[in-house]
């Protein structure tokens, strides 16, 4: 199905406009901002979601140490250029002709330049590390219960194939979820780890992208998991290119 037929809405993306004008009167949904048709049986790409967001009215287990090449999205929101398939274009520019290169999750991976800046290809983010700090609880969560529930969440809510959830680490109060997905591993129809991570990030912040859902209620053996802080690290198949000036 492409959208909920009964009242013509998009279950997986509330930032859409839907109408029964598809083939045979079927419900068809288009993303705000771009007007692109979206498949409501799966997650919408992060690029289209960011574009829609910008168009909306402004109202003994060890934890993983992110590699030196890990990127954090420090630039915040911007109005991205998306390709016809909804992916980020490799080069992004703002209205003042400042340009930069991004990876497949839309995070800047070069210094900013002018219109002459070249971004030869869209570099894939193949490893995402989601670092969460949960609110103190009476006791630590059971690691295997936590692991199972987070894997179930990514499988059922975000429709991410289980093989792409590489690991769940836990050292109270820090939880780390590792998502890995190389270009060669991603088959047609597979949810992208970048899109799943973005939906999760918005859910955790109480800004669910799903239609008609108030927010994420994640429980481990009945105890709500309340996240106080989220950091997401992105690792690209090709290391980013920043000048030494930025690294000091």
């Amino acid at each position: 199905h492409t959208a909920a037929q009964d009242n013509c809405t998009c279950p997986t993306n509330k930032m859409t406009v839907c109408s029964p004008d598809g083939p045979g009167g079927r419900c068809q949904c288009r993303a705000l901002g771009s007007g692109m048709a979206v498949d409501c049986s799966t997650l919408t790409s992060k690029c289209l979601l960011l574009k829609a967001r910008m168009s909306a009215p402004k109202n003994a287990r060890t934890l993983v140490r992110p590699s030196e090449h890990a990127l954090v999205d420090n630039d915040g929101l911007y109005d991205p250029d998306c390709d016809p398939e909804g992916r980020f274009k490799a080069r992004q520019c703002n209205q003042t002709s400042v340009c930069w290169c991004v990876n497949s999750v839309g995070v800047r991976r070069t210094d900013k330049g002018d219109l002459s800046l070249r971004c030869d290809e869209l570099v894939r983010t193949h490893h995402i590390l989601i670092d969460l700090r949960h609110r103190p609880t009476a006791g630590a969560f059971n690691h295997s219960d936590l692991d199972a529930e987070l894997r179930r969440l990514f499988r059922e809510r975000y429709r991410l194939h289980p093989k792409f959830v590489a690991a769940v680490h836990y050292e109270q109060p820090t939880i780390q979820i590792e998502l890995r997905q190389n270009t060669s591993q991603k088959a047609a129809g597979d949810v992208d780890i970048g899109d799943a991570a973005y939906y999760f990030e918005r859910d955790i912040k109480g800004e669910s992208l799903f239609q008609g859902r108030g927010g994420l209620d994640l429980r481990v053996r009945g105890e709500p998991l309340q996240v106080e802080r989220t950091l997401i690290y992105y690792l690209d198949e090709i290391p980013p290119k920043f000048s030494m000036k930025r690294l000091t």
Partner: antibody, heavy 119, light 112 residues
Framework: QVQLQESGPGLVKPSETLSLTCTVS????????VNWIRQPPGKGLEWIGV???????NYNSALMSRLSISKDNSKSQVFLKMNSLQTDDTGMYYC?????????????WGQGTLVTVSS | DIVMTQSPSSLAVSLGERATMSCKSS????????????LAWYQQKPGQPPKLLIS???SRESGVPDRFSGSGSGTDFTLTISSVQAEDLAVYYC????????FGGGTKVEIK
Amino acid sequence: QVQLQESGPGLVKPSETLSLTCTVSGFSLTSYGVNWIRQPPGKGLEWIGVMWAGGSTNYNSALMSRLSISKDNSKSQVFLKMNSLQTDDTGMYYCARDENWDGAWFAYWGQGTLVTVSS
Amino acid sequence: DIVMTQSPSSLAVSLGERATMSCKSSQSLLNSGTRKNYLAWYQQKPGQPPKLLISWASSRESGVPDRFSGSGSGTDFTLTISSVQAEDLAVYYCKQSYNLFTFGGGTKVEIK
């Protein structure tokens, strides 16, 4: 469509064990939790316990020592066992679906089954 | 355990009048991360199972008339029926899901 149906004996003798079954359709027990709630005649609602989708359970602390909840995913059934029944256990027993990650709200309920504890 | 206290226990209102009922919890129901409250309101009519009206303290369920509204945060919550209709005759329960589940004692809405 989502449906829940409670079943079990209407009459139970004091000190005996109550066994109820909640049979569900329209969803999988591996994706949604099922709660048991009861209501004495003319009184309010009391949460009994829950069988989560992942297979773990939680119980009302006041009733925990007498309770056991289990399930059979393949048969789409959740079972409630409560022992050492007394007359004040009389009431309507409901099962209700938890809304998974959208919130622990009970959006779908069975019609309930009346349990009378009497000798 | 979290204790939920509802008041009044019964409320007699004329048709078209506003009805307001209160629910207080013994501890905060606010998730500081998502800024959402783990509180729901249910309506139970005679001889029927309860029906979910409001989730997350203020989110009206689909199909619920807009005369019903929920408000409040932390420990104090309110359910308001802006203009009571005959079909609103029922008992209204609040329920916390911050620490497992507890229902309030209920508020019975009667027609004057």
